[in-house]
């Protein structure tokens, strides 16, 4: 009797099981019932990563530098090429089609998380006794100084975007 | 028991024809491929020709493609090859070989072709 | 057409040795290859499928191994009933060719 299912890694054509082709290889012609499955390696430029019975092999991706992008890994006849950004830049997609500049954190904002080249900066509002007072993709928000350290008083209270101003302590006649 | 028997053979002029037959016997002879493979004396084993089980698609080499014709009668579990415009290089035994998970895994006795005048 | 090339082409040994029987193809077949013993005025018998699945019947001395290009036939230890002619056999892709034989006889 022909089948009706097939085993994992076949497939079901003119009423027999044909073996599926290997990663890294496409499908030339299907079994019959003298012959295996036919299949070829796919070409330096392309790749299957499944068991297929595709009769093309997909290009590798290319990481155009007109778009911010660089190859992170070369493709093989198994996998595809993954792109990353130049530095700089990150992602915009978890495809990493393009890639647009890593944004500052503002002054009040300071960096919790440096961007990648998949990721983009992450900032986090400057919590009280921290600062930040410039527009930054790198600085983590400092702690205003000690005043008390220097031997010296406050005499102006630090915000989220500028630093205490010190001064000397008054003297007491 | 799993039979196949050749008939047909037999001396033939260059140009001439011939019609070889397989009779099947101890198996489902609808459920499987059959095969013809050659063997000139002395000789190593050569592909002649391929038919599937339905009869629907026919396989043949470069060299026999146009003057051999394989068929099958299903109903008289009955395997056929058909030789025209034979030549000296046809000289052979003859054999005809049941296609068990693609393996020639029965073969028949044979039955000797002569192309010679 | 995918080219099989057997060697040696006569393998002189006594009863009781081990015969080592080499098939190499033109291209990859992966393990898409049998192997046929044929004695003198019979028939080709199959003796393994898939370059190493063994057949019911063949007794357990008759092995093969390989995928790719180079395959083996190993008879552990050869018995008189075992000098013959063996051919090896791709099914990878038409046309089905046959290796040219390796004849096994006694030394």
């Known amino acids: 009797e022909p089948p009706t299912a097939c085993r994992e890694k076949q497939y079901l054509i003119n009423s027999q099981c044909c073996s599926l082709c290997q990663p890294g290889q496409k499908l030339v012609s299907d079994c019959t019932e003298f012959t295996e499955t036919e299949c070829l390696p796919c070409s330096e430029s392309e790749f299957l990563d499944t068991w297929n019975r595709e009769t093309r092999c997909h290009q590798h991706k290319y990481c155009d530098p007109n778009l911010g992008l660089q190859v992170q890994q070369k493709g093989t006849s198994e996998t595809d090429t993954i792109c990353t950004c130049e530095e700089g830049l990150h992602c915009t997609s978890e495809s990493c089609e393009s890639c647009v500049p890593h944004r500052s954190c503002l002054p009040g904002f300071g960096v919790k998380q440096i961007a990648t080249g998949v990721s983009d900066t992450i900032c986090e509002p400057c919590p009280v006794g921290f600062f930040s007072n410039v527009s930054s993709a790198f600085e983590k928000c400092r702690p205003w100084t000690s005043c008390e350290t220097k031997d010296l008083v406050v005499q102006q209270a630090g915000t989220n975007k500028t630093d205490v101003v010190c001064g000397p302590q008054d003297r007491q006649r | 028991e799993v039979q196949l028997v050749e008939s047909g053979g037999g001396l033939v002029k260059p140009g001439g024809s011939l019609r070889l037959s397989c009779a099947a016997s101890?198996?489902?002879?609808?459920?499987?491929?059959i095969s013809w493979v050659r063997q000139a004396p002395g000789k190593g084993l050569e592909w002649v020709s391929s038919?599937?089980?339905?009869?629907?698609?026919?396989y043949y080499p470069d060299n026999v493609k146009g003057r051999f014709t394989i068929s099958r009668d299903n109903a008289k579990n009955s395997l056929y090859l058909q030789m025209n415009s034979l030549r000296a290089e046809d000289t052979a035994v003859y054999y005809c070989?049941?296609?068990?998970?693609?393996?020639?895994?029965?073969w028949g006795q044979g039955t000797l072709v002569t192309v010679s005048s | 057409e995918i080219v099989l090339t057997q060697s040696p082409a006569t393998l002189s040994l006594s009863p009781g040795e081990r015969a080592t029987l080499s098939c190499r193809a033109s291209q990859t077949i992966n393990n898409n290859l049998h192997w046929y013993q044929q004695k003198p005025g019979q028939a080709p018998r199959l003796l393994i499928k898939y370059a190493s699945q063994s057949i019911s019947g063949i007794p357990a001395r008759f092995s093969g191994s390989g995928s790719g290009t180079d395959f083996t036939l190993t008879i552990s230890s050869l018995e008189p009933e075992d000098f013959a002619v063996y051919f090896c056999?791709?099914?990878?892709?038409?046309?089905?060719?046959f290796g040219g034989g390796t004849k096994v006889e006694i030394k």
């Open positions: 038919i599937s089980s339905g009869g629907d698609n026919t």
């Open positions: 056999q791709q099914f990878s892709s038409w046309p089905l060719t």
């Open positions: 101890g198996f489902t002879f609808s459920n499987y491929g």
């Open positions: 070989a049941r296609a068990g998970e693609k393996a020639m895994d029965y």
